[in-house]
Interface confidence: low
């Protein structure tokens, strides 16, 4: 059902981890561009996109990779307690813009122990491929759009 | 700048109904171009989105306003539309309605209006 037809999916992860969200986008979709934005009282603010430049500046702590195959996956690094809030992965289809998946962040204390990642379940959706429903594993480095 | 403005809001009983309506108050603007969502911010909560409507006329609903509430576009008039039946008090809330472009990341909201649902 898209945004709205479930609950957000809701994660949690400590200030100083990492989060990784897939979200599914149709196979007809794969050259569209996509979006991760903040819903913000002042708007659903875009803060990554896949089709913004790459040499982006130096501190920037959201990568967006379009893994194709239908399969969109967003990495939150180093989080902040300010990082707190609802996002959504959105893409600009042939159907128009459609919001694939809502992700309800929170924010715990710091642990103590290394970094961690928080893996957020796939996002299924009135709009999801089944072709596009595999699973990959995590990306190597030089795969992700870093810059 | 495009601003948004809502209207239809009010007091009802439970049972009644209402219509929002969200309207730009810039000419030139088009909802046909735009992802149109309807949230809510119930008193003291985080706002939700209730209904969204994308430039192709697909709709989505919230699980807690499915077969209550209908979202529609009038591209004539230029207007969105909330139309709430069957309303129960933890439907009150202040209600706005959202316009998003993913081109360009251009996106507006309106002031948003009071629904109050008692008896």
């Known amino acids: 059902q898209g945004i709205v037809g479930s609950l957000p999916e809701v994660l949690q992860a400590p200030v100083g981890s990492s989060i990784l969200v897939q979200c599914h986008y149709r196979l007809q979709d794969v050259k569209a561009q996509k979006v991760w934005c903040r819903f913000l009282p002042e708007g659903c603010q875009p803060l990554v996109s896949s089709a913004v430049d790459r040499r982006a500046p130096a501190g920037r702590r959201t990568f967006l990779t379009d893994l194709g195959g239908g399969l969109l996956q967003v990495e939150m690094v180093t989080l902040q307690e300010e990082d707190a809030g609802e996002y959504g992965c959105m893409v600009d289809g042939a159907r128009g813009p459609q919001i694939l998946h809502r992700v309800s962040l929170n924010i715990l204390p710091p642990e103590e122990e290394e970094e961690t990642h928080k893996i957020g379940s796939l996002a299924e959706n009135a709009f999801s491929d089944p072709a596009g429903s595999a699973n990959p594993l995590e990306p190597s480095q030089d795969e992700k759009s870093i810059p | 700048q495009v601003q948004l403005v809502e209207s239809g809001g009010g007091l009802v009983q439970p049972g009644g109904s209402l219509r929002l309506s969200c309207a730009a108050s810039?000419?030139?603007?088009?909802?046909?171009?735009?992802?149109v969502n309807w949230f809510r911010q119930p008193p003291g909560k985080q706002h939700e989105v209730v209904a969204s409507i994308n430039p192709n006329g697909f709709t989505n609903y919230a699980d807690s306003v499915k077969g209550r509430f209908t979202i529609s576009r009038d591209n004539v008039k230029n207007a969105v539309y909330l139309q709430m039946n069957s309303l129960k008090p933890e439907d009150t809330a202040l209600y706005y309605c959202h316009a998003v472009r993913i081109s360009g990341g251009a996106n507006y909201w309106g002031p948003g209006t009071q629904v109050t649902v008692s008896s």
């Open positions: 810039t000419s030139g603007f088009s909802f046909s171009d735009y992802y």
